[in-house]
């Protein structure tokens, strides 16, 4: 239904990572313009990316208020020249998303190693903590200060003259391996939230190897 | 924040305080308890996380239990065979990260238990 | 178990002059920074100063800082006034899900 020339938002779609996110829709409009809504279960609509010609929506200001309430968007669609116009029902054409829950469905974005040291036969290998966009006390919070034992990283690392890969995991942001005194390690990390259903890992981390620059080695 | 009202408890009585919390969602922050003898420190006996999961004290032994079901925006304490040592102010805090961090950012004016005979 | 020994009480300082309080982990906190700093006063609860060893709480005064890493904090207080008379206490979570501590707490006397 609606008015002959504008045509319902559709493939409404969440894209969040690290709780940057953003809802996207379809048709590139012909004509028409969109206003978004979004609202927690219990709390009231409100209104964002106001009469846009764009097909996306950075949703990421709302989000972060709460990343563990459930969100729901609306995308209404007006005629281009003729905003206040209506559909046959008396109300704007719109379309609602899919609820999304930012804690329990926001990408893990791909982790970054920060740094690795080897002391003797050990290497201590850091995972930075990324900064997110939500906000406590006008201050962001990083990944682990969201998440907390929640989060957990898996290492991957072999030797630069192997291709058998060993793991190991941490509910921190730091590794401590045993490592073949003399030989020369690869690693990669991969951020995991075990308790999840969905998106539970992120993409593994770019490889970083011993002999480059991120590393430092002690007797 | 703020604590029920303790009071006087005899010996083997059950505890049950609750933690009334206004102006944020327990969804999104946790709760501790924490208790202090008089003329002693703090000590930390547990919190519920805002996923609703409960951490307690090696020391607590199981006489201790946090919940947060009976009613929107409370979090119980309650604890079973009270002794002379369980004498205390006991406080109710929010966590300020929403997990078992330690960073207890909101507190309650605390409320005295006795237990005497 | 985390077992937080804080500095001996009562440590003395001058108006106007800088106290330091240690705290030492018996094993590295929680990603070796989830250690928070209180100020308790005699009949009032905790007030949370200092998060994420160095963060300052909202509403706290600059004079308050913090830091370490791992298993060894300090809380210094520049500046000390008169109303900096209290007890402090450390705090920390673990790794292991169960753990947070409190350290047995220093008092500081401002003369």
């Known amino acids: 239904s609606g008015t002959t020339n504008t045509v319902a938002a559709y493939n409404l779609t969440w894209k969040s990572t690290n709780f940057k996110t953003i809802l996207e829709w379809e048709p590139k409009p012909v004509n028409q313009v969109y206003t978004v809504q979004i609202s927690t279960k219990s709390g009231d609509w409100k209104s964002k990316c106001f009469y846009t010609t764009d097909t996306e929506c950075d949703l990421t200001d709302e989000i972060v208020k709460d990343v563990k309430q459930t969100y729901l968007a609306r995308v209404f669609s007006y005629p281009a020249g003729n905003v206040e116009s209506t559909g046959s029902a008396g109300e704007p054409l719109y379309e609602n998303s899919p609820e999304f829950t930012p804690y329990l469905e926001t990408n893990l974005g791909q982790p970054t190693i920060q740094s690795f040291e080897q002391v003797g036969t050990k290497v201590n290998v850091t995972v930075e903590d990324e900064r997110t966009l939500v906000r406590r006390n006008n201050t962001f919070l990083s990944l682990r200060d969201v998440f907390g034992k929640d989060l957990i990283y898996t290492l991957y690392y072999w030797k630069s003259s192997s291709s058998g890969k060993k793991t190991a995991k941490t509910n921190t942001n730091e590794f401590l391996i045993d490592v073949d005194k003399g030989e020369n390690y690869c690693f990669s990390v991969q951020a995991v939230i075990p308790s999840r259903t969905v998106n539970r890992k992120s993409t593994d981390s770019p490889v970083e190897c011993m002999g480059q620059e991120k590393g430092e080695f002690r007797e | 924040v703020e604590e029920s009202e303790g009071g006087l408890f005899k010996p083997t009585d059950t505890l049950t305080l609750t933690c009334t919390v206004s102006?944020?969602?327990?969804?999104?922050?946790?709760v501790s308890w924490v208790r202090q003898a008089p003329g002693n420190g703090l000590e930390w006996i547990g919190t519920?996380?805002?996923?609703?999961?409960?951490y307690y004290a090696s020391w607590a032994n199981g006489r201790f239990t946090i919940s947060n079901d009976n009613a929107p925006n409370t979090v119980s304490l309650q604890v079973n065979s009270l002794a002379a040592a369980d004498t205390a102010t006991y406080f109710c805090?929010?966590?300020?990260?929403?997990?078992?961090?330690?960073?207890?950012?909101?507190w309650g004016p605390g409320t005295l238990v006795t237990v005497s005979s | 178990e985390l077992d937080l020994t804080q500095t001996a009480s009562p440590v003395s300082a001058a108006v106007g002059g800088t106290v330091t309080i240690n705290c030492q982990a018996s094993?590295?906190?929680?990603?070796?920074?989830?250690l928070s700093w209180y100020q308790q006063k005699p009949g009032q609860p905790p007030k949370l100063l200092i998060y994420?060893?160095?963060t300052l709480a909202s509403g706290v005064p600059s004079r308050f800082s913090g830091s370490g890493f791992g298993t060894e904090f300090t809380l210094t207080i520049s500046d000390v006034q008169c109303d900096d008379a209290a007890t402090y206490y450390c705090?920390?979570?673990?790794?292991?899900?169960?753990?947070?501590?409190f350290g047995g707490g220093t008092k500081v006397v401002v003369e």
């Open positions: 094993q590295s906190v929680y990603s070796n920074k989830y």
């Open positions: 805090a929010r966590d300020f990260y929403g997990w078992n961090s330690g960073a207890l950012d909101i």
């Open positions: 705090a920390a979570a673990y790794s292991d899900d169960s753990d947070t501590a």
């Open positions: 519920i996380d805002s996923s609703g999961r409960t």
């Open positions: 102006g944020f969602s327990l969804s999104y922050y946790g």
């Open positions: 994420k060893a160095s």
